[in-house]
Interface confidence: low
């Protein structure tokens, strides 16, 4: 089938002891090969500081996955979720202020 770019959605969990969990979800993409990783100051975090979900079919002939990491509250501006899929790539910020999610569709 033709390439379907992912919808990327970044969310923050509740604050716990000065830390927050940030999760980057990619959904509705095809084919299933995708790179999804957290970066700090433009540098990919090491694998042992990130948690990945499996790349799973979402029931519409497309796929979904996620990656999460814990960061210190107040350091959100340093982190971006990096996505690469079928030649497209992009970076997605941690939402600032009271907004706790951020959507972006790659074309």
């Amino acid at each position: 089938g033709s390439t379907v770019p992912p919808m990327v959605n970044v969310t923050c969990s509740e604050v716990s002891e000065g830390n927050i969990t940030v999760t980057c979800r990619a959904s509705s993409f095809y084919p299933r090969n995708i790179t999804l990783t957290w970066r700090q100051d433009g540098v990919s975090l090491s694998h042992n500081t990130q948690q990945w979900g499996d790349v799973l079919p979402d029931g519409n002939g497309t796929y979904q996955t996620w990656v999460a990491t814990r960061i210190r509250q107040g350091e959100e501006q340093r982190f971006t979720c990096y996505m690469e899929h079928s030649g497209n790539h992009g970076t997605h910020p941690v939402p600032s202020g009271n907004s706790h999610h951020h959507h972006h569709h790659h074309h």
Partner: antibody
Framework: EVQLVESGGGLVKPGGSLKLSCAAS????????MYWVRQTPEKRLEWVAT????????YYSDSVRGRFTISRDNAENTLYLQMSSLKSEDTAMYYC??????????????WGQGTSVTVSS | DIQMNQSPSSLSASLGDTITITCHAS??????LSWYQQKPGNIPKLLIY???HLHTGVPSRFSGRGSGTGFTLTISSLQPEDIATYYC?????????FGSGTKVEIK
Amino acid sequence: EVQLVESGGGLVKPGGSLKLSCAASGFTFSDYYMYWVRQTPEKRLEWVATISDGITYTYYSDSVRGRFTISRDNAENTLYLQMSSLKSEDTAMYYCSKGGGSTARGALDFWGQGTSVTVSS
Amino acid sequence: DIQMNQSPSSLSASLGDTITITCHASQNIHVWLSWYQQKPGNIPKLLIYGASHLHTGVPSRFSGRGSGTGFTLTISSLQPEDIATYYCLQGQSYPLTFGSGTKVEIK
């Protein structure tokens, strides 16, 4: 070869404004965090500001926050520092530098030659 | 803010000597420390990143060690071209902070 060329420095009166530019070449500019660092006449190095690769995020030192604005034009491969309400303590050599990318966070792997800013009446 | 206490402020050594410069962080910065060399009349240049990794083109007589709060830069077999001021920089959290510098001279 990575090249960073700053311009826009000069002599300005207290309270005045300047806009510094940094023309980048030799690397994929839009993929890297960029930084302004200054060196005081006493040779102390001070981090000034950072901008993320995608223009999304900016960070400032307490001493310049609210007076300086870092920005970038990824189409033109250029980094900027708009400086206003300048004070004598802003007198320094201003360096544009490139984030380390695949090396380590907070490492500045290439620096420009610098542009001198003097704030004096 | 994280303070970086660099010592000594200056040192004088003979050609061929091994010298060590120390940076102490006021809190844990893991390995997010880099070292820079600035020769007289020149710009700073990256020597070491991630506490111990040699930047491209830097001679192997330079080495970095440490993690947490204590870090060292060692120059083995000091050469005339090593006359410079050396600075450390922490990249763990904003504001990024430099050490005050160590001026290295030849006896």
